[in-house]
Interface confidence: low
């Protein structure tokens, strides 16, 4: 009667060849203590014999004898509430369904847990916030659906292949709800980080590379500008011509408007990347800069101090 057995455990567990799997599990048998436990691999019910067939990975019989397979497969549970399992090492051919055959004095139950064992270590997954803006602290998260007490791993953050200096906080969960390893890194990206590659690298306890995930940073930032002036020293005589050019070295997203400012005030009808000042007069001396805006906001170049001297 299924209503007499209540199980809690992760639905699917993930591991790779040579690692291990720790299966947190709790149960309740309402009619008394567990008397027999068999762990099957891919169990199939045989109607002729009214029993389950399949590879027996572990068997705990009523008289308490432990088979030699327990060295690799361990039942770490007890008679009434804990059904935690460990397989160490875990092999590719352990993939499939694990069947926990539980028998109490009067009741029997088969509980199924899925096990997914890959040939090679699977990559972690980097999670980024939906939008990243320059100088605003964000949390980068690297999540791996794996954790096992017998197989320590580490997640390392790299920026353009170099270990990131910010301290990451690594947490693990080995509970009936979830099994994972997570690394969180607080990071204040600058505009220069736009387009850079961030890697979360999975390593074993010795620092050996196992797998990785990479993302390209999309750092929203105001336009970054360079101003060039001809003549380069910005010292001219009255009647001379001056050309100032505004160059956008980076903008994310694309820029939308361009304007020029003199002494902090916008110059009317000057909305191109080149400012041509013809036959300048003394009162045109002052501090000039260009301003280019995008959806993030305006970016300003450095100021050029134009000195117009008497002819």
């Amino acid at each position: 009667d299924s209503s007499k057995w209540v199980f809690e455990h992760p639905e699917t567990l993930y591991a790779w060849e040579g690692a291990c799997v720790w299966i947190p599990c709790t149960y309740r048998a309402l009619d008394g203590d567990l008397e027999s436990f068999i762990l099957f691999h891919n169990p199939e019910y045989n109607k002729n014999t009214s029993k389950f067939d399949g590879t027996r990975l572990y068997e705990s019989t009523k008289d308490g004898k432990v088979p030699s397979e327990q060295k690799r497969v361990q039942f770490l549970g007890d008679k009434n509430k804990n059904c935690t399992l460990s397989i160490h090492p875990v092999h590719l051919n352990d993939s499939g369904q694990l069947g926990l055959r539980m028998e109490s004095k009067t009741e029997k139950w088969m509980e199924r847990i899925h096990l997914n064992v890959s040939e090679r270590p699977f990559p972690p997954h980097i999670q980024l916030p939906p939008e990243i803006q320059e100088s605003q602290e964000v949390t980068l998260t690297c999540l791996l659906n794996f954790s096992c007490y017998g197989y320590p791993i580490q997640l390392q953050w790299l920026l353009e292949g170099v270990p990131m200096r910010q301290a990451a906080v690594t947490s693990t969960s080995l509970t009936i709800k979830s099994v994972f390893t997570r690394s969180e890194l607080k990071f204040s990206p600058q505009w220069s980080h736009h387009g850079k590659i961030v890697t979360c690298q999975l390593q074993d306890a010795d620092g050996k590379f196992l797998s990785n995930d990479t993302v390209q940073l999309n750092v929203k930032h105001t336009p970054k500008l360079e101003i060039k002036v001809t003549p380069s020293d910005a010292i001219v005589r009255e009647g001379d011509s001056v050309t100032m050019t505004c160059e956008v070295s980076s903008s994310n997203p694309e820029y939308t408007t361009v304007s020029w400012l003199k002494d902090g005030t916008s110059l009317k009808k000057q909305n191109t990347f080149t400012l041509n000042l013809r036959e300048v007069t003394k009162d045109q001396s002052g501090k000039y800069c260009c301003q280019v805006s995008n959806d993030v906001g305006p970016g300003r170049s450095e100021e050029v101090f134009l000195q117009v001297q008497y002819a």
Epitope: Q154, V162, R165, T170, S188, K196, A205, G207
Partner: antibody, heavy 117, light 112 residues
Framework: EVQLQESGPSLVKPSQTLSLTCSVT????????WNWIRKFPGNKLEYMGY???????YYNPSLKSRISITRDTSKNQYYMQLKSVTTEDTATYYC???????????WGQGTSVTVSS | DVVMTQTPLTLSVTIGQPASISCKSS???????????LNWLLQRPGQSPKRLIY???KLDSGVPDRFTGSGSGTDFTLKISRVEAEDLGVYYC?????????FGGGTKLEIK
């Protein structure tokens, strides 16, 4: 007060493996970065590598094939092994704590190692 | 690897006089995080190295203010306004911006 103490053999034969221990008191090796640096005769310093609070490692590429840094958190010790040593590995070996992105600010007293047959 | 070049190799100074050590890196030490990881160490005779300055100009706790660090990019300087007897030893610059971290060759400060 944070203290680091290196220990290991003072004399190693060429082709052997040099094994050094750094014992840490006053701080836990599960926080910060824990480094090995060596100083050759003539004052040249070389950075060898670290083991971090999480157990991740970084090795100087010039030593990568020969060096291994491990730890035992229960003893609050970390270790450095250097394989296939030559006379060029004769140096004073220091362990040092790297607690932040700023710099190393706690060093051991250093242990002098001579490689000679 | 980033090469750190220190000059002079030896510096002989009278107590009370100023001293200056130069350190040049083969590439800029300005990190992508906006910080410049240039540090100065002093190794007094018979002692382990001790950090004096980090992030170019920040003095470590307990370091007298006669020490000042300056510079940016690839050129850095350590100055001692008035040398005292306890300042003798070997001074090293080292960079923590690029992996592997590298050290200058050292400058030996002697008292005249």
């Amino acid at each position: 007060e944070v203290q680091l103490q290196e220990s290991g053999p003072s004399l190693v034969k060429p082709s052997q493996t040099l094994s050094l221990t750094c014992s840490v008191t006053g701080d836990s090796i599960t926080s910060g970065y824990w480094n090995w640096i060596r100083k050759f005769p003539g004052n040249k310093l070389e950075y060898m590598g670290y083991i971090s609070y999480s157990g991740s490692t970084y090795y100087n590429p010039s030593l990568k094939s020969r060096i291994s840094i491990t730890r035992d958190t229960s003893k609050n010790q970390y270790y450095m092994q250097l394989k296939s040593v030559t006379t060029e590995d004769t140096a004073t070996y220091y362990c040092a704590r790297y607690p932040s992105p700023d710099a190393m600010n706690y060093w051991g007293q250093g242990t002098s190692v001579t490689v000679s047959s | 690897d980033v090469v750190m070049t220190q000059t002079p190799l030896t510096l002989s100074v009278t107590i009370g006089q100023p001293a200056s050590i130069s350190c040049k890196s083969s590439q800029s030490l300005l990190d992508s995080d906006g910080k410049t990881y240039l540090n100065w160490l002093l190794q007094r005779p018979g002692q382990s190295p001790k950090r004096l300055i980090y992030l170019v100009s920040k003095l470590d706790s307990g370091v007298p203010d006669r020490f000042t660090g300056s510079g940016s990019g690839t050129d850095f300087t350590l100055k001692i306004s008035r040398v005292e007897a306890e300042d003798l030893g070997v001074y090293y610059c080292w960079q923590g911006t690029h992996f592997p971290w590298t050290f200058g060759g050292g400058t030996k400060l002697e008292i005249k």
